[in-house]
Interface confidence: medium
């Protein structure tokens, strides 16, 4: 008996009623008497809807199901789920009996549309080109997961410093939460586009912000301008200089160094001498290359609080400023793998890998191959705690069912030091223990 | 020397079968997975799928799901790939690879020399 | 799927010029592989790993990058160099290459 479902996935929206198509060709004489109908769950062969010795025996699914009784003795079996909700994704399958049998499985896809994007902007005040700001872009009661993206005013996406987090409710929604780290320029707008890729519904915001404009003096200050990478625990030099005119002495000179988002005092000379470090006497500068127009400041004992912006500010008659980042970095541990269970392990046998890497900074990205280098991107949850100092310890889980050998490695790379801590971990296709025994 | 020889090029008619083979000399032909990539005529490159000889395992691109066959024969060190429902977009250059390296980095460093498939009534 | 998407995808330069291409991934990835195809002949690695030369590939090549952005770069230009180039990875299935960058004669 040939039994016909659409091949694609049946789209329903959170709420509203679907219809898992299903259709028979009946015989000429065929009765409804005759028919035995079974809707189940594809995967748990749970009962969902029957009709069975003539009759509608309803539903076995929460109350939520009918059939489109005055049609099925035209071989309509099609199934009308009501009020669907994120739990009822999955695979449905249509048993029809008459003497011969048939059976075919239609996917239910649930969607839900994310809501337009609320954008919030921190710091929201006093805003200067140079500052750096959080721009926090949230959408609401989305399902599936939603993919994000930010783009500047001209459409140009913009990936650099972009968090994105997406927490489902009890109902399944998911709720998007992207944040993007930025340096301002003189104005721009910024966007975030939420999409469904199911619904293939965009969802955007965004935001224009005009800083005010920084009093510009006529002294040129030059900063570099890539990020000074520090390691924790080293020294760092935050170079910025000057060009002194003929005549000029230190006596003239203003030099302040302080963050750039806090205004925080880092250090300072004035009145020709050096009034020390306001920062945690950390902090120096090179005070016999200053009058040469040397302004630039030495950092101790790097710590990862020490990430951020630092403007360096030069008042002679004039003045000038410039804003120099430093980035902290640390490198990751040689990855521990410990695997559980490790004892009379069999090929089928499900068995979680976790590897570990320690102290790093910043966040480390983790990746999990086989032992001819394929991903292994299936079930992998990756979690990474920041201990006292700022730093890393990252742990990646990687559940997987066993073949008859195989090696299972992880790669945790720095993505500031571009480096990489590896380990791996292979298993016979003998019944075994891990660590192997001496 | 390491090589790939990949067997000669085929004409097809459409809703036909094509069976490329693909004989691996020169290393441990169990060691290695070997993948497919394909090249229509002035496009780029197209993984299809790939096979682990000593396993058996295959992978294949969604895109051919249900088309592609991948096998491999331990005992002559060959692999072959089997299409099925050719048509005319089908028309490419077939080319097996070696994916080669150590933990955690992998590439492919051998290529056969490319198998001309040509699908037309 | 993991996009990779090379720009440019022509390139005319001159024997001598310094030439770098870019491979932008839609998602990060581990590494990037690069190879250098000739009309009528199979791909030929040059640079695994992001940055690791392949045997035999001179030195005026050389790759860098991370997370989404990687680029190979000749540094001068040499008349066997005109070819075509692609990217490739497979942190995440499928394997996928860049759509080739052709490097013409100016």
């Known amino acids: 008996l040939e039994v016909q479902v659409p091949e694609d996935p049946v789209v329903a929206l959170v709420g509203t009623d679907a219809t898992l198509r299903c259709s028979f060709s009946p015989e000429p004489g065929f009765s409804l008497a005759q028919l035995n109908l079974i809707w189940q769950l594809t995967d748990t062969k749970q009962l969902v809807h029957s009709f069975t010795e003539g009759r509608d025996q309803g539903s076995a699914y929460a109350n939520r199901t009918a059939l489109f009784l005055d049609l099925l003795a035209q071989g309509n079996a099609s199934l009308r789920l009501q009020r669907v909700r994120v739990a009822d994704e999955g695979s449905f399958t249509c048993f029809v009996s008459i003497r011969d049998f048939g059976s075919a499985a239609v996917s239910l896809q649930v969607a839900a549309p994310y809501s337009k994007p609320s954008m919030t902007l921190e710091p929201n005040k006093d805003l200067r080109p140079g500052d750096t700001v959080t721009i926090t872009c949230s959408s609401y009661r989305g399902y599936p997961e939603a993919e994000v993206f930010w783009q500047d005013g001209q459409g140009a996406p913009l990936t650099g410093n972009v968090t994105t987090s997406q927490m489902a409710n009890e109902q399944g929604l998911f709720d998007v939460h992207s944040v993007l780290r930025v340096v301002l320029g003189a104005n721009g707008t910024y966007s975030c586009l939420v999409r469904n890729p199911v619904l293939q519904q965009d969802a955007h915001g965004s935001i224009t912000i005009t800083p005010q404009r920084s009093p510009t003096g006529a002294v040129e200050v030059q900063v570099p301008e890539d990020p000074v990478v520090a390691l924790v625990g080293t020294d760092a030099t935050l170079r910025c200089s000057f060009s002194p005119e003929p005549g000029f002495s230190l006596a003239q000179l203003n030099l302040i160094w302080q963050l750039t988002d806090t205004k925080q005092l880092v250090h300072s000379f004035t009145e020709g001498r050096d009034q020390g470090s306001a920062y945690a006497n950390r902090t120096a500068l090179f005070l016999d290359l200053l009058a040469q127009g040397n302004a630039s400041l030495r950092l101790q004992r790097v710590r990862v609080a020490d990430e951020g912006s630092f403007t360096c500010f030069v008042s002679i008659r004039d003045f000038g400023s410039a804003a120099v980042s430093l980035q902290v970095a640390a490198p990751y541990s040689k990855p521990s793998m410990t695997l559980e269970p490790n004892k009379d392990l069999r090929p089928g046998d499900t068995v979680t890998i976790t590897c570990s890497s320690y102290r790093g900074y910043p966040e480390a990205e983790v990746f999990w191959q086989d032992g001819q280098g394929a991903p292994l991107t299936g079930n992998v949850t990756t979690s990474q705690m920041a201990n006292e100092q700022g730093l890393f310890d990252v742990h990646s889980v990687l559940r997987v069912v066993l073949g008859a050998n195989g090696t299972y490695s992880c790669l945790v790379r720095n993505p500031v030091l571009q480096q990489d801590a590896h380990g791996s971990v292979t298993i016979t296709g003998q019944p075994m223990t891990f660590p192997p025994e001496a | 020397e390491v090589q790939l020889v990949q067997s000669g090029a085929e004409v097809k008619k459409p809703g036909s079968s094509v069976k490329v083979s693909c004989k691996a000399s020169?290393?441990?032909?169990?060691?290695?997975?070997i993948h497919w990539v394909r090249q229509a005529p002035g496009q780029g490159l197209e993984w299809m799928g790939y096979?682990?000889?000593?396993?058996?395992?295959?992978d294949y691109a969604q895109k051919f799901q249900g088309r592609v066959t991948l096998t491999a024969d331990k005992s002559t060190s060959t692999a072959y790939m089997e299409l099925s429902s050719l048509r005319s977009e089908d028309t490419a250059v077939y080319y097996c690879?070696?994916?080669?390296?150590?933990?955690?980095?992998?590439?492919?460093?051998?290529w056969g020399q490319g198998t001309t498939v040509t699908v037309s009534s | 799927d993991i996009q990779l998407t090379q720009s440019p995808s022509f390139l005319s330069a001159s024997v001598g010029d310094r030439v770098t291409i870019t491979c932008r991934a839609s998602?990060?990835?581990?590494?990037m592989n690069w190879y250098q195809q000739k009309p009528g002949k199979a791909p030929k690695l040059l640079i695994y790993?992001?940055?690791n030369l392949a045997s035999g590939v001179p030195s005026r090549f050389s790759g860098s990058g991370s997370g989404t952005e990687f680029t190979l770069t000749i540094s001068s230009l040499q008349p066997e160099d005109f070819a075509t180039y692609y990217c490739?990875?497979?942190?995440?299935?499928?394997?996928?290459f860049g759509q080739g960058t052709k490097l013409e004669i100016k």
């Open positions: 690879a070696r994916y080669s390296g150590s933990t955690p980095y992998w590439y492919f460093d051998v």
């Open positions: 020169g290393y441990s032909f169990t060691s290695y997975t």
């Open positions: 096979i682990n000889p000593n396993s058996r395992n295959t």
């Open positions: 998602s990060s990835v581990s590494y």
């Open positions: 790993a992001t940055s």
């Open positions: 490739q990875q497979w942190s995440s299935n499928p394997l996928t």
